[in-house]
Interface confidence: low
Amino acid sequence: QNCSGPCRCPDEPAPRCPAGVSLVLDGCGCCRVCAKQLGELCTERDPCDPHKGLFCHFGSPANRKIGVCTAKDGAPCIFGGTVYRSGESFQSSCKYQCTCLDGAVGCMPLCSMDVRLPSPDCPFPRRVKLPGKCCEEWVCDEPKDQTVVGPALAAYRLEDTFGPDPTMIRANCLVQTTEWSACSKTCGMGISTRVTNDNASCRLEKQSRLCMVRPCEADLEENIKKGKKCIRTPKISKPIKFELSGCTSMKTYRAKFCGVCTDGRCCTPHRTTTLPVEFKCPDGEVMKKNMMFIKTCACHYNCPGDNDIFESLYYRKMYGDMA
């Protein structure tokens, strides 16, 4: 991930890149690589797509190791076939208020986005679209088999399902912060982003944090108890060190991860917090990155539909972030 070694490229002449992704020389001038795209992790070796006006944003000078591909200031956004100027706000549908910022769109849900967990008065919650209403609402289905309700409820715990109010007024500034986006990877290290103007100049800025919903090597389905269909939060095993492009976290963490379901439900982070993690790299450099830590997960049928851009983008948001 740095240029401190001889040029050693894979044997094949050049990688085949997905449609729309440029084949470029890596940052060390060594090998041809597929350029990183908007929002992806980038390094000295793995450059961002220059043909799309992207650059590797490292955050602070101390972190000149791994960054996030970011559009140059003022880049417009193309969303739903429409071009929006940087800084322009628009309502993408009755459900979302969006803002374009340097080539990236951040949206805030106008509908309640809570994940409702089963409770004694509503053991089988389901979100439905009601005629004439924009926002879906929760309804409580009656259980098919009444006998299971009692014992099943013993395992249910009421969770705090809403985070802080994302809008507040402060010194002539309407502070707006979008929810953190879903982690870019369903397993392994990914990125989660949000847009906020919660700063001294009330200027919109993009924030990003590392995230890991679950490790890729964990075979969680094997651990689901007989008769059960989900592991919501697997037992925390031994403390682990996080890895990021060849750099290793300096501390070990007893992190919580989300489990899996075998019945088509999604198991996603429900309440999270953001903490700084220091990584040490093989060339001795230390970098600090914000990272999502999971407090609780929720297993729910409210999974994103591939056919609905808004659902897939925003139904997987994370709530109750403490940072």
Partner: antibody, heavy 114, light 110 residues
Framework: EVTLKESGPVLVKPTETLTLTCTVS????????VHWIRQPPGKGLEWLGV???????DYNAAFMSRLTISKDTSKSQVVFTMTNMDPVDTATYYC????????WGQGTTVTVSS | ESVVTQPPSVSGAPGQRVTISCRSS?????????ANWVQQLPGTAFKGLIG???NRAPGVPDRFSGSKSGTSASLAITGLQAEDEADYYC?????????FGGGTKLTVLG
């Protein structure tokens, strides 16, 4: 052609300080780090420390209090200093280029004796 | 007990394939351990063979290859030749420092 060459005293007295210089050619010290490794007679290799291309250093914890590695990039030289030498420090000392330890110096044999 | 262990010796006939293991006693070997392999031919200086688990150093023939699995990194040499007889050392990076294995003497039989 990439070369590394160690130079310094052959004999050091106990409690004295050993200073070795690694002079490199064929590459820049702003592009590659340089490691120091030693091999006692008839034994295996022991990693001592490294100075990275951007000037940061890492040391073997066992020698942390005794070791200093610095460099003069313009002279293409890395300087290795080990204080309070002891007869058990008798060994051949090598410098090697970072990037898979791909190039090594020929080594300089240092004897610690009174 | 050493953190990084290698077998003291391995042997093979010319043309054969041999592997030398490098075991980490403190967990799985990952890409972040940057497994390195160096060769010391009798009476000569050291030469780097493999860096970053599987990247061959310049000029190293493709008979030499590196890999990792579980708690070990491995060096494989195919088509063994008489000139491969040497001492081989692995080195693993642990966040702040490298640790060398004790070395393995490769003998080419016959």
């Amino acid at each position: 052609e990439v070369t590394l060459k160690e130079s310094g005293p052959v004999l050091v007295k106990p409690t004295e300080t050993l200073t070795l210089t690694c002079t490199v050619s064929g590459f820049s010290l702003s592009t590659f780090g340089v490691h120091w490794i030693r091999q006692p007679p008839g034994k295996g290799l022991e990693w001592l420390g490294v100075i990275w291309r951007r000037g940061g250093t890492d040391y073997n914890a066992a020698f942390m209090s005794r070791l200093t590695i610095s460099k003069d990039t313009s002279k293409s030289q890395v300087v290795f200093t080990m204080t309070n030498m002891d007869p058990v420090d008798t060994a051949t000392y090598y410098c090697a280029r970072d990037g898979g330890f791909d190039y090594w110096g020929q080594g300089t044999t240092v004897t610690v004796s009174s | 007990e050493s953190v990084v262990t290698q077998p003291p010796s391995v042997s093979g006939a010319p043309g054969q394939r041999v592997t030398i293991s490098c075991r980490s006693s403190i967990g799985a070997v990952t890409t972040s351990n940057y497994a390195n392999w160096v060769q010391q031919l009798p009476g000569t200086a050291f030469k780097g063979l493999i860096g970053g688990t599987s990247n061959r150093a310049p000029g190293v023939p493709d008979r030499f290859s590196g890999s990792k699995s579980g708690t070990s990194a491995s060096l494989a040499i195919t088509g063994l030749q008489a000139e491969d007889e040497a001492d081989y050392y692995c080195a693993l990076w642990y966040s702040t420092h490298y640790v060398f294995g004790g070395g393995t003497k490769l003998t080419v039989l016959g």
